[in-house]
Amino acid sequence: QESLSCDASGVCDGRSRSFTSIPSGLTAAMKSLDLSFNKITYIGHGDLRACANLQVLILKSSRINTIEGDAFYSLGSLEHLDLSDNHLSSLSSSWFGPLSSLKYLNLMGNPYQTLGVTSLFPNLTNLQTLRIGNVETFSEIRRIDFAGLTSLNELEIKALSLRNYQSQSLKSIRDIHHLTLHLSESAFLLEIFADILSSVRYLELRDTNLARFQFSPLPVDEVSSPMKKLAFRGSVLTDESFNELLKLLRYILELSEVEFDDCTLNGLGDFNPSESDVVSELGKVETVTIRRLHIPQFYLFYDLSTVYSLLEKVKRITVENSKVFLVPCSFSQHLKSLEFLDLSENLMVEEYLKNSACKGAWPSLQTLVLSQNHLRSMQKTGEILLTLKNLTSLDISRNTFHPMPDSCQWPEKMRFLNLSSTGIRVVKTCIPQTLEVLDVSNNNLDSFSLFLPRLQELYISRNKLKTLPDASLFPVLLVMKIRENAVSTFSKDQLGSFPKLETLEAGDNHFVCSCELLSFTMETPALAQILVDWPDSYLCDSPPRLHGHRLQDARPSVLECHQ
């Protein structure tokens, strides 16, 4: 059997050591003890007696099935306790009585059915994070379960086999910053929602089949809900249940952000929100995020004209990796307040983009992200986007473009352009001179000779440049990142010729550790101020005797350098 390894500050690591019991020899000097991934099974009343100053105890996945009632009685300083993924089929309030300093408690993934016969947490007045429940057996939430808890930063409840929710069980917690609920179905959703309306600021619903969700008015008085964010992850919706969910928004008037992540819509987008009287109640929602939305019949999807009016005040929309191939012109025109639009990892091509960015489309748009779509012509893309009079930032990275032409047209206010990972080999005057930030990293560039008088930031890492670009090309450059190229050297003159340069990242290049380069680095201790990744990323590639040495440590041979 292996032993613990402890550092000078009292942090002890005993993970995956094949312990079959709590190891002996624990002391009051220990501040943190991690015994995860062992086969401990049992914690006796004296096993942790010596650890009076322990602040962190991690016992995750250690096959624990029995803990004596007073096993933790000496742990008054404990702030973090992780008992997740063990074999505890019942929980005891006597474990937690002495733990008055506890801030974090994870009991998730143990096979209990309830949280115990009596309230577990009345003494945990400092608790900030609580994780409870499991996938298969946790079936009941009762009013006594959260007694004594008044405020939590994070509460996560995995209740995927919930059979009974006692009304008002969650109401006793007056303030919850982030509540994550894993519910397999919507049976108790309305009851829970009513109980958390006045306490939760961010509600995250996971793995819930909402296909049969039906709204009914909540039994609540006029309530001013603090909820600002609502997220659905791994959930299933239908057109009908989406309409029903919208009706909940009348109770959360301060909601500013809605997110759907990895959800499935078994429908066609035939929404009818007008009858749910929510148009005005969406007034404060500014951010809508949709990622990996799976629509089995996406090829039959509607034009969403029924939700146009819902989204008129939204400022930020992300629809990522969801097979989007068109935003209809009329929809774009209705998105009057939209300032940020991210359509990454979709199926957009120039022909349909032209329809999406029609005259009057997205009139307030400042940032457009079209990364990893199916765009091919930089010239066409720029031309299509001329309708966007307020566009300042464009990300068309991870599209495979044809070679760029000599001239292109772009929206006149454009200041930021991301062309990273687009396979470009040469930069030409197609790139607008108005740019302040240009990202051309991860391409096939072996040179860069384009004059950009306003450029402040240049990202050109992961290319094939052999030297730093000429400073005269960028008279106001502040930041250059040129890591992972083939740069072999840089000199005092080169760096000095960038009059305003504040940050240079040039690590992981093929440095030839010549007398000149090494002399320069030795004589210039201020390099660390400008080279943000200095010294660890700056290694000699040659000569052979210095290969792999840091430039900072490499010493030129007196013989070589004074010939």
Partner: nanobody
Framework: EVQLVESGGGLVQAGGSLRLSCAAS????????MGWFRQAPGKEREFVAV????????DYSTYVKGRFTIFRDNAKNTVFLEMTSLEPEDTAVYYC???????????????WGQGTPVTVSS
């Protein structure tokens, strides 16, 4: 109506590995949550692992977490259970199940396979 057929069970030594497969018939496979359960002789059926419609969420019984991996291939209408570091206590008949709800509660699954036996010898 989805039909499920498990395969891949057999005899293996403690510490060894097995991969179970469950092939589903029908065109709506990707709409189902898929679960694996097991039943040892003389014991009740118990939850092993579950995967959601897209494969984006997975969960495991504490008894197998870290050793078993569930994954699915919707294009091939198949769900898999990769079992490593097998122990004699893992000996059981393993069943694949399909349902509408992401849960470890076996009563919520509507469709079941006939099972494939796994024996782990010490």
């Amino acid at each position: 109506e989805v039909q499920l057929v498990e395969s891949g069970g057999g005899l293996v030594q403690a510490g060894g590995s097995l991969r179970l497969s469950c092939a589903a018939s029908g065109r709506t496979f990707s709409r189902y949550v898929m679960g694996w359960f097991r039943q040892a002789p003389g014991k009740e059926r118990e939850f092993v692992a579950v995967i959601n419609w897209s494969g984006g969420s997975t969960d495991y019984s504490t008894y197998v977490k870290g050793r078993f991996t569930i994954f699915r291939d919707n294009a091939k209408n198949t769900v898999f259970l990769e079992m490593t570091s097998l122990e004699p206590e893992d000996t059981a008949v393993y069943y694949c199940a399909a349902g509408e709800y992401y849960t470890g509660d076996s009563s919520r699954y509507d469709h079941w396979g006939q099972g494939t036996p796994v024996t782990v010898s010490s």
